[in-house]
Interface confidence: medium
Amino acid sequence: TSFCHQLRWVSKRSFKNLLGNPQASIAQIIVTVVLGLVIGAIYFGLKNDSTGIQNRAGVLFFLTTNQCFSSVSAVELFVVEKKLFIHEYISGYYRVSSYFLGKLLSDLLPMRMLPSIIFTCIVYFMLGLKPKADAFFVMMFTLMMVAYSASSMALAIAAGQSVVSVATLLMTICFVFMMIFSGLLVNLTTIASWLSWLQYFSIPRYGFTALQHNEFLGQNFCPGLNATGNNPCNYATCTGEEYLVKQGIDLSPWGLWKNHVALACMIVIFLTIAYLKLLFLKKYS
Amino acid sequence: TSFCHQLRWVSKRSFKNLLGNPQASIAQIIVTVVLGLVIGAIYFGLKNDSTGIQNRAGVLFFLTTNQCFSSVSAVELFVVEKKLFIHEYISGYYRVSSYFLGKLLSDLLPMRMLPSIIFTCIVYFMLGLKPKADAFFVMMFTLMMVAYSASSMALAIAAGQSVVSVATLLMTICFVFMMIFSGLLVNLTTIASWLSWLQYFSIPRYGFTALQHNEFLGQNFCPGLNATGNNPCNYATCTGEEYLVKQGIDLSPWGLWKNHVALACMIVIFLTIAYLKLLFLKKYS
């Protein structure tokens, strides 16, 4: 049978499984909505003062790292069906590429997209983030990209493994270190050069940087201060631009989009690794 | 047999198990040393400028939350020995109190104390935290108290359960919410009053507040500015005191010690719950 026919068949079956066992999907949606409302309530109505900087950075950091850690569950995608995959592949049901793409399109794509949409729709308006349509969609897109790259990493680690727990542990350790290098817990400009290159392997760093660039640009955080006069506040962070520069974030448009490019590259690399591991798996089955 | 004899017997056996299976203990020590060195390298030589505020807050937050999340493993203390405990209790080997206290003294006490000592000894000097002996020991004591209260909470949740995973999941969810209310990701002074009471149930909040009070008091963060005069800028955070006030932290000595009192109360409450659950368990065995 053709690749398209196999792809349609795998996607259909995966989608049916998803709809046939709606508890998991519904539970995930409910948890996301509840968490979104809790975060919205905690950070409700962000102010434009020094607490506004801390709270904006805090909530964007939380959303980014939450997208990462909740993507750990993606390790199950290929692990739980490992034996079935090997059996069906050997029986000639489908190519590895059909199975791989089918699972991604029917399972990973919708289940990682939903939380990003839900979080953005709830949190954005409850918090009163930048009231601009483009900024709203950039945030949604960024959270999706973080979720996809984290899930892709999960697949790359877990594909071909029989035990979920080892992959989960490895993922969690990776994300803890990535979280340190994301740019909230440590100012990335202060890390020694022999260590700072590690930031470029951090998924949440790209997501957090993009979200900050998107939210902070054009904001004022010193209400009533005439920033154009002789400002005695050398040490104050009075504008979003000043905050971003202090974090070592490039203010240009490329300073925003290069993060999405990096996440896209990571997705491609991790999915390639996952695919190769599945290929490798069937050779040795 | 007397309570003391039973206590000595349980403690001796637990301690022998610990020494007879040294891999776990040694692994924990190695992991702690490595993590301490990594954190020390990332934050090496904190500066006294605006990045110094961010990095100090970041590392203290990480140490506090790490103490919490690594204490989740304490759920295993009573769970893995549940059947053995019921069998031996029914056989009249010991009272519940002897078993409970014996396990705490021989297992929980040393294994939760070590990481606090190791972290403080490595991190304190690599980072160049406040060069005062009392501040060093306050930090060590605070990390110990956080570890003990988090472990006590783990015991309270897990005691009498047969499956580790459920208790672990429940603990993790609790710590995620506690982490939000710890005071880095959100400025606690900005949370609505109908929600802000939740901060008083947050273990990392007490630890983080104590560590910040201990480290920030008496620091200057605006190099070249005479911070003793009236700071002409309301918007800059030029002293540790200004930073603490913005975080809603009481500058008095009680502002430090009340956190340890709260953690001590939590330890007592959680251990009481754990003990009662073990008593309840043997009644229904």
Epitope: E241, V245, P253 | -
Partner: antibody
Framework: QVTLKESGPGILRPSHTLSLTCSFS??????????VSWIRQPSGKGLEWLAN???????AYNPSLKNRLTISKDTSNNQVFLRIPSVDTADSAIYYC???????????WGQGTLVTVSS | TQSPPSLSASLGDKVTITCQAS??????VAWYQQKPGKAPRLLIR???TLESGTPSRFSGSGSWRDYSFSISNVESEDIADYYC????????FGGGTKLELK
């Protein structure tokens, strides 16, 4: 408080080299993200950005004048310099220096120094 | 390209100045006011963000290549030269607009 003050020769002859100094206080050119730019304004005309120097010594020049401009700094004395060799009358203008954060617009300006190129 | 080069207005009028870039500049536009013998003063950055101290009668808008600056209710103290600045790629000022009283 942040202040910037430009100083220059006032009047100089064509083909001579124009040397300008910007002395500043209230900030340091070693602070992450801080840069200083030179901008000029010929009499009755618009503003023209010339050159920029940053904390880590990166330099940028107006592409149309790049070959003629040299910007430098003396961090210990809180000064930034601009050199324009072989000037002509078209270089007559008020020269301003301004403090800038990265590529953020200029919030802090000096009062300007008038340079007249005349034979 | 900034237009118009000069503008006459009566007190209380609404005036608008436009700036068109040769390519997409992603909202990286600032607006300055300059009074005779004085250095320029930053009024608006990032297309529409008013600097602290800028009266609310001043506003900015735009995207991609086209940007505008408005004064909703002209006062005598607003009589000055106005410049747009793009800062997406180095810095380029517009040619300026002279605002005069009718």
């Amino acid at each position: 408080q942040v202040t910037l003050k430009e100083s220059g020769p006032g009047i100089l002859r064509p083909s001579h080299t124009l040397s300008l100094t910007c002395s500043f206080s209230g900030f340091s050119l070693t602070t992450y993200g801080i840069c200083v730019s030179w901008i000029r304004q010929p009499s009755g005309k618009g503003l023209e950005w010339l050159a920029n120097i940053c904390w880590e010594d990166s330099k940028a020049y107006n592409p149309s004048l790049k070959n003629r401009l040299t910007i430098s700094k003396d961090t210990s004395n809180n000064q930034v310099f601009l050199r324009i060799p072989s000037v002509d009358t078209a270089d007559s203008a008020i020269y301003y220096c301004a403090r800038v954060f990265n590529n953020y617009p200029f919030p802090y300006w000096g009062q300007g120094t008038l340079v007249t190129v005349s034979s | 390209t900034q237009s118009p080069p000069s503008l006459s207005a009566s007190l209380g009028d609404k005036v608008t100045i436009t700036c068109q870039a040769s390519q997409n500049i992603n909202k990286y536009v600032a607006w300055y006011q300059q009074k005779p013998g004085k250095a320029p003063r930053l009024l608006i950055r990032y297309t529409s963000t008013l600097e602290s101290g800028t009266p609310s009668r001043f506003s900015g808008s735009g995207s991609w290549r086209d940007y505008s600056f408005s004064i909703s209710n002209v006062e005598s103290e607003d009589i000055a030269d106005y410049y747009c600045l793009q800062y997406v790629n180095l810095w380029t000022f517009g040619g300026g607009t002279k605002l005069e009283l009718k």
